[in-house]
Interface confidence: low
């Protein structure tokens, strides 16, 4: 499999058949597939060097792994997008051997002197062809040369099989399955051959191809494949319930932010709640996690403005649940990205020198920002798309807080909507879905570059649009939701999560 280890070294060779028998639309489809693969790999923060070859009668090398920009995913994608099916029109045979020899030439070393660390680089070849080779020798011989070059399968004690993977995608109207099977790697419990039909669900294909065991701790990663559960799609989501004897129970959401912490809303708890009465579950697991302590933001005080006639005051409505035992990350349990961390810098593929302010400009520009939250409806987690009003609609969004029960007497809305809040909801630019009571504490998320970054914690809403947890279809335009802006509580997060290896900026 493609071992996505951010600390490892990898070369990926993309080889695309542009011969007559493929056809223009299949060629374009294959290109799209490779673009998606580059994006998927890049989303892991892995920076492999790419080689890019198209071929028919002759190969054409578009990107060499030795080029400085070969590890720049955006640049490689640009080169790939600029390739035309017509480029091989005049010599349109299928010489797969020559194409693989072009790959071999990129792998080999000048004067056959291997450079320092050569044996630590993993090599992945992704060949897209119909297998209808009609020129040159059998490409399998080149596969053997490559195996020899990389010292694979020679030493019984250390066969190094995981340093080479050859994937073959059968593209085109007629695919010679035997030919393509011959070229693909054969490894137990792994799939290295994919068909055209598979390419309709690329996420399923990538799920078969990628070994992410070295990068399970990466924040904001998801799997969208068809067999995936709700928690493959939002693996950070935590369900919280507080059992209060004789008072029923309170349901909230939260987000896994590290192996020991779940971030949620402070108002989900009261000072009387004992740790044993708080149930937290993650990854869709039945068992509840043991809680060590709930850490409230020190400035949170729901009764802070009672004397001023404000019954409930949600400023700094954030809390961290510290777990007794370390979470075991997997595909259904992994953290969401937090602002102003090194993980988010990498997730957004920004330079390592990126500042917290630059992350803020990237994630929360002064405009309507497309975001999402996760809600549970009929026992299923669903993503709800909303817009954070952070530009010219911000003021009117915040002013609608006056329609919230108990806030009608508030003279100055900034008394309740402090700078700590982000505002969503309403009907412009689109009719936003609203949060329900049980969504409190869940993350408000920005989805960028295939990664999910939490920018807010769901706190309170103007209108209860969810009778019996069913969202009403018709809601008033003033139905707004308010979320604690994580950029505004960073010192506290930084302090409490300082041992969690998040690399706060």
């Amino acid at each position: 499999k493609i071992v996505l280890d951010p600390s490892g070294s990898m070369n990926i060779y993309l080889v695309l058949d542009g011969s007559d028998s493929i056809g223009a639309s299949n060629f374009t489809g294959a290109k799209k597939c490779l673009v998606n693969l580059i994006e998927k790999v890049a989303s892991y923060g892995v920076k492999p060097r790419y080689g890019l070859v198209t071929y028919a009668t002759y190969p054409k090398i578009w990107v060499k792994v030795s080029e400085a920009d070969s590890s720049n995913a955006d640049w490689v994608t640009k080169q790939l997008n600029e390739i035309n099916y017509e480029d091989h029109k005049l010599k349109s045979g299928t010489n797969t051997k020559k194409a693989l020899q072009a790959v071999y030439s990129m792998m080999s070393w000048p004067d056959d002197v291997p450079p320092e660390g050569w044996n630590r680089t993993r090599h992945v070849i992704i060949l897209m062809t119909d297998g209808l080779h009609n020129m040159g020798g059998d490409p399998i011989t080149v596969i053997d040369e490559i195996r020899d070059l990389l010292y694979i399968g020679k030493d019984r004690k250390n066969p190094r099989e995981d340093y080479l993977d050859v994937y073959v995608f059968g593209v085109g109207p007629l695919v010679n399955q035997v030919n393509i099977n011959a070229l693909a790697s054969k490894k137990d419990n792994e799939q290295h051959v994919f068909k055209v039909k598979d390419m309709e669900n690329l996420e399923d294909v990538f799920y078969q191809m990628i070994d992410e065991s070295q990068s399970l701790s990466l924040c904001g990663m998801v799997w969208e494949h068809r067999k995936g559960t709700d928690y493959h799609k939002q693996p950070w989501q935590a369900k919280i319930s507080v059992i209060r004897p004789s008072k029923g129970h309170e349901s909230c959401m939260g987000a896994v932010v590290s192996e020991y912490f779940v971030l949620t809303a402070a108002h989900c708890f009261t000072v009387d709640d004992k740790e044993h009465s708080i149930k937290v579950s993650v990854g869709g697991e039945k068992r509840d996690l043991e809680i060590e302590v709930v850490l409230f933001h020190p400035n949170y005080n729901i009764n802070g403005k009672k004397e001023a006639g404000i019954p409930e005051f949600y400023d700094y409505d954030v809390a961290l649940i510290k777990l007794k035992n370390k979470l075991k990350y997997g595909q259904t349990i992994r953290p969401i990205c937090l602002p102003c961390t090194e993980g988010t810098t990498r997730a957004l593929r920004l330079p390592p020198t990126t500042t917290c302010q630059q992350q803020k400009e990237e994630l929360l520009p002064a405009q309507d920002i497309k975001a999402l939250f996760v809600s549970e409806e009929e026992k299923k987690l669903t993503r709800k798309e909303v817009y954070i009003k952070n530009g010219d609609k911000k003021g009117s969004c915040e002013r609608d807080a006056q329609y919230a029960p108990g806030y009608d007497k508030v003279k100055d809305i900034s008394e309740v909507v402090t700078p700590r809040f982000l505002c969503t909801g309403g009907v412009s630019p689109y009719a936003d879905p609203n949060t329900c009571r049980g969504d409190s504490g869940g993350p408000l998320i920005v989805h960028k570059r295939s990664r999910f970054i939490q920018v807010g914690v769901i706190s309170w809403g103007v209108v209860d649009v969810c009778k019996n947890q069913k969202r009403q279809k018709q809601v008033p335009a003033h139905a707004r939701d308010f979320h604690i802006n994580l950029f505004q509580v960073l010192p506290w997060l930084k302090e409490k999560l300082q041992d969690e290896d998040l690399g706060f900026l």
Partner: antibody, heavy 115, light 107 residues
């Protein structure tokens, strides 16, 4: 009740070394970041070092970086400060303190660097 | 480094008075400021953290306020046991820094 008791302070010559200890009790030591702060003869407070609760991270100001090493033994509930290449400006009362910001301080141990 | 400036080295007060001790940070530290009280021969004691939160057991005559760069510790109804040196401290970023202290004395 939270208690922090420093020890190991002494009179030492410039260029010399010294190891301070701080015995903690009354709280779960391994749950907290710990720091050393010193108070100069002029009564100024200076942060010296911080170590995270599991000891993975250590932080120092430039004035002591490379000369001082903070460490901890969570099994013994003890915090340490190894000081080397001592200078006269290191003369101070050294406190160990819990958390960040420091919520509990010990009584201090006196270090005098003089020839 | 962030410099914490306490402009008054000394402040005179009388029992029952209200006094405000100020502290200015050289750059924005949000609300990551703490106030300590130190009496002669004793170690510093935490009074206020996160600019305005009273530490456990601290009498409510002590209040903290401010954010960004300007911070104030206010003592209403000063008691004789409040005569001490007060230090402000920023824990927003390393290196952690303290103010030089303000000594509260009787007029």
């Amino acid at each position: 009740e939270v208690q922090l008791v420093e020890s190991g302070g002494a009179l030492v010559k410039p260029g010399g070394s010294l190891k301070l200890s701080c015995a903690a009790s009354g709280f779960t030591f391994s749950n907290y970041a710990m720091s050393w702060v010193r108070q100069t003869p002029e009564k100024r407070l200076e942060w010296v070092a911080t170590i995270s609760n599991r000891g993975s991270y250590t932080y120092y100001p430039d004035s002591v970086k490379g000369r001082f090493t903070i460490s901890r033994d969570n099994a013994k509930n003890t915090l340490y400060l190894q000081m080397s290449s001592l200078r006269s400006e290191d003369t101070a009362l050294y406190y160990c303190a819990r958390e960040r910001p420091m919520d509990y301080w010990g009584q201090g141990t006196s270090v005098t660097v003089s020839s | 480094d962030i410099v914490m400036t306490q402009s008054h080295k000394f402040m005179s007060t009388s029992v029952g008075d209200r006094v405000s001790i100020t502290c200015k940070a050289s750059q924005d530290v949000g609300t990551a400021v703490a106030w300590y009280q130190q009496k002669p021969g004793q170690s510093p004691k935490l009074l206020i953290y996160w600019a305005s939160t009273r530490h456990t057991g601290v009498p409510d005559r002590f209040t903290g306020s401010g954010s960004g760069t300007d911070f104030t510790l206010t003592i209403t109804n000063v008691q004789s046991e409040d005569l001490a040196v007060y230090f402000c401290h920023q824990h927003s970023s390393n290196p952690l820094t303290f103010g030089a202290g303000t000594k509260l004395e009787l007029k």
